[in-house]
């Protein structure tokens, strides 16, 4: 018996179609992904074969305006017009909190959302009992097929779940779950999940009775054979693991932002073991057309889109400085006020011992790309923010050592006066240089902001330490030059949508007025 | 032929214990979940356990668990229902039933059952 | 729990009427029913599986229908041999539950 499973993660709000890089989509004849492709395959291939399922292995919340205005609202409508089968639950579907999960996408899903690990207690228990489930046995032809959730158990660290959902180990959580849909005689099992490819690995190891993993959350581009677009594969498509009872457990990402579809084949034997797998993701480039019917539907929750772009969202009592005469030289208030923001947006898990788990960012200058004139009433609408941050990225938390901290620092100055994007604007740290002295040793001070205190106050970087960091996840990948970041990062989890992160934080505080600080010196 | 065969009921006094036993033929036991389904007099039927077919998994209703113990002896063909701390409302008469292997269980063996009265 | 409540408690009916039970389930359970037929002294017999699917054997005059949390047994023509009690079965979850019984009784 030979099942078809399509699949995607991390989608991020691209129900548009986008650029090759995920961004805004500019010239349309060569850009890729969006719902309405999406949906042109899906049913192609639904029409080809027999036995089809489409999962989402979570993630679909944040990462471009159309979350912002909408809220879930648009994932919930499109995926049930696309028909998904089975979606699991990301960290970042957390975003608005629990409400922001259930009312847009929970109640409205026509299709199970899934996590065995979530559980939740109090009185949300009530709530939103039978909203979200462990897992979901789905017939599919004359068979049936069990689908079991898992998300990132370090999602109250990522989002806002609040404190009555209680997010426990994947492998402690799916297996009761898997024993007992083997006891319901369901014999082939898919642990659908966000918590990235070395969990999904763990869970292929570990997990006895599950025949495939599915998985999100790190992004990983898998594919076997010639890579059809820019993405490196982390390995072939699908990853086989060997599981500790000796089974052979095939293991599927397909990269993120709706630019490919996972496509995967496995045959089953009549006692529900695996015979064979395999497939490719399938770019969805211009060459695959936009379904009419779903672009119209897009075209017209648009509307909406360019209406909100142009709303006040706050005000600002002073220039915001985001030219880059300023913030690749030396301190700026727009690279204060970014910073700031990303901080704030990473406010959570205050217990007695820190008063926040992270207190640090850095941003490279090159990033920001407009400032704000208070002149014209001083507004700040989502339009002069897209100006400052035009490249669609997020702002992410990263583990890092002290030791790589402060190579960042030297690659900062490392060619300091040439006008270039690597010179870094800061929160929670203050950094002097001393640029007489030689490239690789212009860092005397580095002194960062203390988490495991009641009072924050500056204490002195330690080499071997490990600190958390909230950056772009354009420096988190080592762009623009600092490589040392993406070689020896311990930990990376994606973050919020980085327009959004600063819009929220402006209308939060309503009237801002960032200086310069002596952050940098 | 298909069939199974229970074995071990009788009268108990409350407090005690009893172990019923159902012996299987006719088809390859070890392929099977196997399931124990009571029926008090004069009432309907109630779904005690369930031992999955190599024995690791096993689930139990609420008014019996942590007083009955299912297990199976694939080698014998067996299948046992360890009964302790018997009260009188577990006065019943006591089937074993093979749940088939697709989804979702429904039984399509049952056994002719044993009656199990509890009662000072 | 899942729990399944049949109606009615009883029927009474002659040969050759058309019976129809039903069997509600307290939460979406699909198309995961099945149903049985008792008589006196005699162990269940499996008559319906997944809501509708006849199990080998059994006179076409037993069919099933429904979905979700609303389900039917239909006897489309009474025979002398169907006079006995019905239940309907839930293997969505555990624990597995019937229903409380339909008793088909000689008008």
């Known amino acids: 018996w030979e099942l078809t499973i399509l699949h995607t993660n991390d989608v991020h709000s691209r129900l548009e179609q986008t650029s090759e890089d995920s961004s805004k989509c500019v010239n349309a004849s060569r850009c890729m992904g969006g719902v309405a492709r999406l949906f042109t395959k899906v049913q192609q291939i639904r029409r080809a074969e027999p036995n089809v399922l489409l999962l989402d292995a979570g993630d679909q919340y944040q990462g471009t305006i159309w979350f912002t205005v909408y809220k879930g609202a648009e994932v919930a409508h499109f995926m049930n017009a696309l028909r998904y089968d089975a979606m699991a639950l990301g960290n970042h579907e957390f975003d608005n909190g629990v409400e922001g999960l259930i009312e847009p996408l929970l109640k409205e899903a026509k299709f199970p959302i899934l996590s065995a690990n979530i559980k939740a207690k109090g009185p949300l228990a009530s709530q939103i009992s039978g909203l979200y489930l462990p897992y979901k046995v789905l017939p599919v032809g004359d068979e049936v097929v069990g689908i079991v959730g898992y998300t990132s158990k370090e999602t109250p660290f990522l989002s806002n779940p609040g404190t009555n959902l209680v997010f426990e180990d994947e492998i402690t959580a799916l297996q009761p779950e898997v024993d007992k849909l083997k006891t319901l005689n369901v014999n082939k099992i898919i642990a659908l999940g966000h918590s990235g490819f070395e969990t999904d690995k763990l869970i292929a190891q570990k997990v006895r009775g599950v025949d495939v993993v599915v998985g999100g959350h790190s992004n990983t581009f898998l594919y076997t054979g010639n890579p059809p677009s820019k993405e490196v594969p982390a390995g072939k498509y699908p990853f086989i693991v060997t599981s500790d009872d000796g089974r052979k457990v095939p293991v599927v990402q397909a990269y993120a932002f709706g630019k490919y579809l996972g496509y995967l084949k496995i045959e089953f034997d009549e006692r529900g073991n695996v015979i064979s797998s395999h497939g490719n993701p399938i770019l969805l480039n211009s060459s695959i057309p936009e379904d009419p019917s779903i672009k119209a539907d897009i075209n017209k929750w648009r509307i909406k889109l360019d209406n909100y772009s142009t709303q006040e969202l706050g005000k600002t009592i002073v220039y915001l400085d985001g030219s880059s005469q300023s913030c690749r030289f030396r301190e700026c208030n727009m690279g204060n006020l970014i910073c700031d923001a990303m901080i704030n947006n990473n406010l959570r898990h205050a217990d007695e011992m820190f008063w926040n788990h992270v207190s640090m960012c850095i941003l490279n200058g090159g990033g920001i790309r407009s400032p704000i004139d208070e002149r014209n009433n001083g507004t700040i609408t989502w339009e002069n923010l897209a100006a400052v941050l035009p490249f669609g990225g997020t702002f992410d938390l990263v583990q890092l050592k002290g030791s790589t901290l402060k190579k960042a620092f030297e690659h900062s100055v490392h060619r300091y006066g040439q006008s270039t994007g690597e010179f870094l604007q800061v929160g929670g740290i203050h950094v002097v240089y001393d640029l007489s002295r030689k490239p690789g040793d212009r860092v005397v001070k580095l002194d960062v902001l203390c988490t495991k205190c009641r009072v924050p106050s500056y204490d002195p970087l330690k080499m071997d330490e490990i600190y958390k960091v909230i950056l772009p996840n354009f420096l988190a990948n080592g762009g623009d030059g600092f490589q040392m970041i993406k070689d020896e990062l311990l930990r990376h989890d994606s973050g919020d949508q980085d327009i959004n992160v600063v819009s929220t934080y402006i209308s939060k505080m309503k009237v801002i007025y960032p200086a310069v600080e002596g952050r940098i010196k | 032929q298909v069939q199974l065969v229970e074995s071990g009921g009788g009268v108990v006094q409350p407090g005690r214990s009893l172990r019923l036993s159902c012996a299987a033929s006719g088809f390859t036991f070890s392929h099977y979940g196997m399931h124990w389904v009571r029926q008090a007099p004069g009432k309907g039927l109630e779904w005690v356990a369930v031992?999955?077919?190599?024995?690791?998994?096993?689930y139990y209703a609420d008014s019996v668990k942590g007083r009955f113990t299912i297990s199976r002896d694939n080698s014998k063909n067996t299948l046992y229902l360890q009964m302790n701390s018997l009260r009188a409302e577990d006065t019943a008469v006591y089937y074993c039933?093979?749940?088939?292997?697709?989804?979702?269980?429904?039984?399509?063996?049952w056994g002719q059952g044993t009656m199990v009265t509890v009662s000072s | 729990d899942i729990q399944l409540t049949q109606s009615p408690s009883s029927v009474s009916a002659s040969v050759g009427d058309r019976v129809t039970i039903t069997c509600r389930a307290s939460?979406?359970?699909?198309?995961?029913l099945a149903w049985y037929q008792q008589k006196p002294g005699k162990a269940p017999k499996l008559l319906i599986y997944a809501a509708s699917s006849l199990q080998s054997g059994v006179p076409s005059r037993f069919s099933g229908s429904g979905s979700g949390t609303d389900f039917t047994l239909t006897i489309s023509s009474l025979q002398p041999e169907d006079f006995a009690t019905y239940y309907c079965?839930?293997?969505?979850?555990?624990?597995?539950?019937f229903g409380g019984g339909t008793k088909v009784e000689i008008k």
């Open positions: 039933a093979r749940g088939w292997l697709r989804y979702p269980i429904a039984f399509d063996i």
């Open positions: 031992i999955s077919d190599e024995g690791s998994n096993k």
């Open positions: 079965q839930q293997a969505n979850d555990f624990p597995i539950t």
């Open positions: 939460q979406d359970i699909s198309s995961w």
